[in-house]
């Protein structure tokens, strides 16, 4: 199964999920870390504001489930959430899912290797109790708590390598790219919007590659 197989529109699209707009467009008032997407975004200003809060109402997710998460670490999770909620450039990696809270998700988004490495390094000294944050929480209080028997330890003991963090954390929403920032071949979580959004070029490249592959498959089936 190739990423994006369920969609024909791969460029400048918003995912069908809990808080996403149906179509991307300008959002002048995007908050703080989400501001790089203000020229063209899938998130609203209020979503961008809310996701900067601890235990925001968006998902009732508490970053501080094992004591206070270090600010240097937390900023990566906020940036990850901005990318998830705001980016119109992840169409090539959208997959349909049968989940109560969303109809689509991202799978294997090629995250630039430096962004993953830095995220992992900055979270070394923070603490968590799980290696996959999509499932297995105790939600009885309405907010995620560590399940019985899950001990709070350093991030490194649950995510021993950069790939374990970036690929395992959200059930393989990301994969670590072998490409570097600025290559045009990997998605940047962090970018300076004064230079434009580098992820537009990346989405175009992978969308084109997927259309070529789809064409080859059609050609193959036609002759066999």
């Amino acid at each position: 199964a190739d990423p994006g197989q369920d969609r024909t529109d791969l460029l400048n699209v918003c995912m069908d999920a809990k808080h996403h707009k149906t179509k991307p467009g300008p959002e002048d008032k995007l908050h703080d870390q989400c501001s790089p997407w203000k020229k063209n975004a899938c998130c609203t200003a209020s979503t961008s504001q809310e996701l900067h809060k601890d235990t925001s109402r968006l998902y009732n997710f508490n970053w501080d489930h094992c004591g206070k998460m270090e600010p240097a670490c937390k900023r990566h999770f906020i940036q990850d959430t901005c990318l998830y909620e705001c980016s119109p450039n992840l169409g090539p990696w959208i997959q349909q899912v049968n989940q109560s809270w969303r109809k689509e998700r991202f799978l294997d988004v090629p995250l630039c290797k430096e962004d993953c490495q830095r995220w992992w390094e900055d979270c070394h000294t923070s603490h968590t109790c799980k290696s996959n944050w999509h499932r297995g929480w105790d939600w009885t209080s309405g907010v995620n708590k560590c399940p019985a028997g899950a001990l709070c330890r350093t991030f490194e003991s649950y995510f021993p390598t950069p790939a374990a963090l970036c690929e395992g954390l959200w059930s393989h929403s990301y994969k670590v790219s072998n490409y570097s920032r600025g290559s045009g071949r990997c998605i940047q979580m962090w970018f300076d919007s004064a230079q434009g959004n580098p992820n537009e070029e990346v989405a175009r490249f992978y969308a084109a590659a997927m259309h070529v592959n789809a064409g080859e498959m059609l050609h193959h089936h036609h002759h066999h």
Partner: antibody, heavy 118, light 109 residues
Framework: EVQLVQSGAEVKKPGASVKVSCKAS????????MHWVRQAPGQRLEWMGW????????KYSQKFQGRVTITRDTSASTAYMELSSLRSEDTAVYYC???????????WGQGTLVTVSS | SSELTQDPAVSVALGQTVRITCQGD??????ANWYQQKPGQAPVLVIY???NLPSGIPDRFSGSSSGNTASLTITGAQAADEADYYC???????????FGGGTKLTVLG
């Protein structure tokens, strides 16, 4: 393209040691863990242990604790598995496998057959 | 215990749907992964993180999970799907990995 290429087949006598290598290419070696899994003829897959290629930390299955040593050479992007005090029941194909997240092995080596016979 | 239990053998008629299961306590809080292994070959990842399909794996393969049981479903089984199937999972205590005993799938007809 990601590739894991293992060293060739070995024949060893009981009591000896064997060291199998696994050369990785096509990805950033230190960003992933490398695991070793073995399979005796006609038997199930059996997890042996893993190494964090970034910092060299290791974790071994209780069954092999004290007999297995997993190491890596980051400059050569190569992982090694050494098994000592070999016995006939160690005759198996030994695989290295890249771990994307605690047990999701997306790439495997071709396997190395180790035969232990007197 | 940290064991994963699989049925030793399952058969399916060509073109029919088959479900292979994997049971164990570690699956309550960790995802299962599934591998296909053909004789003389290395295993191939067919489902990871419970339901994700690696690139190049046909979408007749799917994964799901409920409680302490993970399932691999093949919808419209083909002759090429005849193989051994193994599940594995992380065991949270000690960061170990455990494999199931494997299920031999036979495709009839």
């Amino acid at each position: 393209e990601v590739q894991l290429v293992q060293s060739g087949a070995e024949v060893k006598k009981p009591g000896a040691s064997v060291k199998v290598s696994c050369k990785a290419s096509g990805y950033t070696f230190t960003y992933y863990a490398m695991h070793w899994v073995r399979q005796a003829p006609g038997q199930r897959l059996e997890w042996m242990g893993w190494i964090n290629a970034g910092n060299g930390n290791t974790k071994y299955s209780q069954k092999f604790q004290g007999r297995v040593t997993i190491t890596r050479d980051t400059s050569a992007s190569t992982a090694y598995m050494e098994l000592s005090s070999l016995r006939s029941e160690d005759t198996a194909v030994y695989y290295c496998a890249r771990d994307i997240s605690y047990g999701s092995f997306d790439y495997w080596g071709q396997g190395t057959l180790v035969t232990v016979s007197s | 215990s940290s064991e994963l239990t699989q049925d030793p053998a399952v058969s399916v008629a060509l073109g029919q749907t088959v479900r292979i299961t994997c049971q164990g306590d570690s699956l309550r809080s960790n995802y299962a992964n599934w591998y296909q292994q053909k004789p003389g070959q290395a295993p191939v990842l067919v489902i990871y993180g419970q339901f994700n399909l690696p690139s190049g794996i046909p979408d007749r393969f799917s994964g799901s999970s409920s409680g302490n049981t993970a399932s691999l479903t093949i919808t419209g089984a083909q002759a090429a799907d005849e193989a051994d199937y193994y599940c594995d999972s992380r065991v949270s205590t000690g960061n170990h990995v455990v494999f199931g005993g494997g299920t031999k799938l036979t495709v009839l007809g």
